[in-house]
Each structure stands twice: as structure tokens, then as C-alpha cells.
């Protein structure tokens, strides 16, 4: 008789999850010499240990501490790029501007990017059928708690000028409920961070509005200012040209506003 299995509202664990995490770790340590000391076997086992045999609605940041310890990494604290609802462009940017880093350019972010995972209480099985949805089921699920944990640590590490890329095509350009709005903004350290600079990315080619005047951006400015951090904002009217100019800053067309 098949054992009753909890049905959650979200998609199940990504297929070949263990193999994917292990392979990503191996690949990352090959590409990043500063992380070559990392033992990927121990990293995978600590990752697995954070959620296996635990109720997938009862995961805590503490569960991920062994993984955090193994994945400890120093990135230049003044070269951090945060993003909200515009991951692809942020990643394209750091692929060109190699001295800047998103969370997914770090080992732990790279391991988990675009993956889903969860286990079941009291069994060593990974649940490939379904996992809890943040809204419909519970917020303390393995994926959400992981990203909350690594995002908090990433924000805490930032210093000097921190950049954030925001999606100007969304109804809420700054969303208080996003990981950026609910975690990262509140964990920037005022004693280390001088300025948060927002880059608002425009979607339409003919969109010439100043989206830095958007009410949600003003709300972000207010939150940041209350935390004794300066705020600045720039419109990126042409993201394609923006990337092109990052690649070729000497190009004559790159002196005008992008």
C-alpha cells in the first residue's frame, strides 16, 4: 500500500537535484580558484541535511548554518549588485562587468539558482512530486528560508556604494514583499554602507518617463534614508545599449544618456 504523501501547491524538487548541486559545486570551484579548498561532498551533505527528514513548513535559518559555514566566501563588499524582479539582466551585467557580484555569482547562490527542493518529515526521501508554495502553503519552506538566509548574509556583507537593479516595467518597481524589499534592504549595515544606488530598468523603447519619481521608489528612498543610508536613483532607458556600453565603454554612442 503506497504511503500517504503530503500534496503541496508548488512544483516538486527539481529532477536530479543531488547530481545538479554536486556538479554545480564542482564546476564553481574549478572556475573560482579562491574556492578550490571547498569540499563539494561536504557542501552537498550539509545542503541535504538542512531539509531532509524535516517538515517542509518548519525549516529555520539554523538548519542552513552548516551549509553557510562551508560556503563562506569573501566577495569585494563594494562591488555588490542586488536585484529585484530582473534577474536575467543583472546576471548579464555581472557576466560582462566581472568585478561586480550578484548573489548568484557566489557559490551558495550559484548552487541553488532556479532550483526547487524539499523533503518529508521523518523520511530520508526527497519530494519530487510537490513542495510548499510560499503563499499558498507556508513561508518557512526549504527554498524560501534558504534564499532569506543567503540574501541576509549577502546584504550584511555589503559596503560603500551598493547597487540595486529594479524592473521599471512592474506595477511595483520597488516591492516591499520581494526578497530585496523584505530582507536585503533591512540588512544593509548603515555603519558600512554609504549609498544605495537604484538602477531602474525601462522596458519600452519609447518610455522616457523619469521612473525615479515613481511612488514605490520614493517609498524605498524613505526606508533607506531612515536607516541613515544615502539614496540615489538612475533611469536606464535602454538596457540593451546599457549592456553594450558596459562591454565597450569607449564606443562614441556611450557618452549620451542610456
Amino acid at each position: 500500500v503506497p504511503r500517504w504523501r503530503q500534496q503541496w501547491s508548488g512544483p516538486g524538487t527539481t529532477k536530479r537535484f543531488p547530481e545538479t548541486v554536486l556538479a554545480r559545486c564542482v564546476k564553481y570551484t574549478e572556475i573560482h580558484p579562491e574556492m578550490r579548498h571547498v569540499d563539494c561532498q561536504s557542501v552537498w551533505d550539509a545542503f541535504k541535511g538542512a531539509f531532509i527528514s524535516k517538515h517542509p513548513c518548519n525549516i529555520t535559518e539554523e538548519d542552513y548554518q552548516p551549509l553557510m559555514k562551508l560556503g563562506t566566501q569573501t566577495v569585494p563588499c563594494n562591488k555588490i549588485l542586488l536585484w529585484s524582479r530582473i534577474k536575467d539582466l543583472a546576471h548579464q551585467f555581472t557576466q560582462v562587468q566581472r568585478d561586480m557580484f550578484t548573489l548568484e555569482d557566489t557559490l551558495l547562490g550559484y548552487l541553488a539558482d532556479d532550483l526547487t527542493w524539499c523533503g518529508e518529515f521523518n523520511t530520508s526521501k526527497i519530494n519530487y512530486q510537490s513542495c510548499p508554495d510560499w503563499r499558498k502553503d507556508c513561508s518557512n519552506n526549504p527554498v524560501s528560508v534558504f534564499w532569506k538566509t543567503v540574501s541576509r548574509r549577502f546584504a550584511e556583507a555589503a559596503c560603500d556604494v551598493v547597487h540595486v537593479m529594479l524592473n521599471g516595467s512592474r506595477s511595483k518597481i520597488f516591492d516591499k514583499n520581494s526578497t530585496f524589499g523584505s530582507v536585503e534592504v533591512h540588512n544593509l549595515q548603515p555603519e558600512k554602507v554609504q549609498t544605495l544606488e537604484a538602477w531602474v530598468i525601462h522596458g519600452g523603447r519609447e518610455d522616457s518617463r523619469d521612473l525615479c519619481q515613481d511612488p514605490t521608489i520614493k517609498e524605498l528612498e524613505s526606508i533607506i534614508s531612515k536607516r541613515n543610508i544615502q539614496f540615489s536613483c538612475k533611469n536606464i532607458y535602454r538596457p540593451d545599449k546599457f549592456l553594450q556600453c558596459v562591454k565597450n565603454p569607449e564606443d562614441s554612442s556611450c557618452t549620451s544618456e542610456i
Epitope: 543531488p18 547530481e19 554536486l22 556538479a23 559545486c25 564542482v26 564546476k27 570551484t29 574549478e30 578550490r36 579548498h37 571547498v38 569540499d39 563539494c40 561532498q41 561536504s42 552537498w44 551533505d45 550539509a46 541535511g49 552548516p66 559555514k69 562551508l70 530520508s124
Partner: antibody, heavy 112, light 112 residues
Framework: SLEESGGRLVTPGTPLTLTCTVS????????MAWVRQAPGKGLEYIGI?????TTYYATWAKGRFIVSKTSTTVDLKITSPTTEDTATYFC??????????WGPGTLVTVSS | DIVMTQTPASVEAAVGGTVTINCQAS??????LAWYQQKPGQRPKLLIY???TLASGVSSRFKGSGSGTEFTLTISDLASADAATYYC??????????FGYGFGGGTEVVVK
């Protein structure tokens, strides 16, 4: 450094525990393994224990061996030795780089 | 479990000559492959890790290449001290469904 001990002559079926004493290695962040080599034969993995403490075994070794550790030692228990388990047993450290540290090995002879 | 197939089992070459040893993995192990030299009564000595990186203190006459599933060790300008058995080794990692650690069967190099 790594140093194996506990190898001796045992009769078939008598459980035997080998101990690897470690110095200068943080066992909470490194994977340790046991490898063996029968006389005149090749090297073979028995099992590993990761920094996190999870154990994995080669298929042929499951149920026949148990790997465990403390903060300074890694043990290998041969649950019910047979004459085929006569070999030199090596304790090794495995990293993402390679199996870079080997103990000198300890000889186990199983004979009636 | 991963299977490492090493060829040839034995090879003979003259001093000053070149020897090539091949190793095939049963699954993609990226560049997580090492080569070892072992002489009778001694523990294995690491020559190459990460498929092509020379271990500290090892002669540049030893060259490793390959990635994925196909790997090669080339020993050039053969010296009498190179007479030994050579092993390839995967250290890719283990999950509950696969054990990615394993050795090839070994290649005995005889120097004339």
C-alpha cells in the same frame, strides 16, 4: 597527517575496527575515505564520510563495512571479515582537488 | 557506482621513450580525475589532479589531459625510476543514488 592502526590477524567472522588518527585536519570540513588494496591487486574505495558526517559506500561494501568518526579519528569497522578482506587498508583525505593525503596503511589478515 | 576503465594493463618501454595510459569513466566526472604512481610496498603518490594539474614536486615529464569521460596520462623521456603501477582515480562525489569515487584497474609500466 594520517595514521592507521588496528590491523592484525583475525579469524573469519570476528569484527574488527581500524582507526585513523588525524592531526592538522579539520574533519568537519573535509571528506575522509577508506581505500584498500589486496596483496598484488589494485586500489578500491570502501566508503567515505563527509565533513557533514554523512557516509556513503561502494555498492560491494554496503553492509560489510561501517565508517564513523570523532573530531580526531575516522574508524572503519569490518563487520564480519572473510578471507577476501585480507588487504592493506588506507585512510585518505579527499577534497575537490584530489585524494591528496594518504596514511601509510595498516595490514589486515583474515585467516582461520 | 562509477566504473573507471584503465588501459593498457601493462606497457613496456625503453628509457627515454614515451608511455601513454588511458582512462575512461562510466559517467561525466568533469575534470575530477587524479593519477597516482605506486611502487611495491609504498602508498600511492599523487602525480596529477584535476585531470591536468601537476602535483607539487612532480616532474613535468608527467602530463595529464582530458575531461568528461576520457582521460590520458603521458610519461615522456621515461626514466628507470618511473617503473611502477599507475592508477587513475575519480573523486567526483557521492549521492544516495551514486558513488562517484573509484580507481582504474592500474597500469604496470616496465622500463627496459
Amino acid at each position: 597527517s594520517l595514521e592507521e592502526s588496528g590491523g592484525r590477524l583475525v579469524t573469519p567472522g570476528t569484527p574488527l575496527t581500524l582507526t585513523c588518527t588525524v592531526s592538522g585536519i579539520d574533519l568537519s570540513i573535509y571528506t575522509m575515505a577508506w581505500v584498500r588494496q589486496a596483496p598484488g591487486k589494485g586500489l578500491e574505495y570502501i566508503g567515505i564520510i563527509s565533513g557533514y558526517g554523512t557516509t556513503y559506500y561502494a555498492t560491494w561494501a554496503k553492509g560489510r563495512f561501517i565508517v564513523s568518526k570523532t573530531s580526531t579519528t575516522v574508524d572503519l569497522k569490518i563487520t564480519s571479515p572473510t578471507t577476501e578482506d585480507t588487504a592493506t587498508y588506507f585512510c585518505v583525505r579527499t577534497t575537490v582537488q584530489s585524494t591528496d593525503l594518504w596514511g601509510p596503511g595498516t595490514l589486515v589478515t583474515v585467516s582461520s | 557506482d562509477i566504473v573507471m576503465t584503465q588501459t593498457p594493463a601493462s606497457v613496456e618501454a625503453a628509457v627515454g621513450g614515451t608511455v601513454t595510459i588511458n582512462c575512461q569513466a562510466s559517467q561525466n566526472i568533469y575534470s575530477n580525475l587524479a593519477w597516482y604512481q605506486q611502487k611495491p610496498g609504498q602508498r600511492p603518490k599523487l602525480l596529477i589532479y584535476k585531470a591536468s594539474t601537476l602535483a607539487s614536486g612532480v616532474s613535468s615529464r608527467f602530463k595529464g589531459s582530458g575531461s568528461g569521460t576520457e582521460f590520458t596520462l603521458t610519461i615522456s623521456d621515461l626514466a628507470s625510476a618511473d617503473a611502477a603501477t599507475y592508477y587513475c582515480q575519480s573523486y567526483y562525489g557521492a549521492t544516495s543514488s551514486s558513488f562517484g569515487y573509484g580507481f582504474g584497474g592500474g597500469t604496470e609500466v616496465v622500463v627496459k
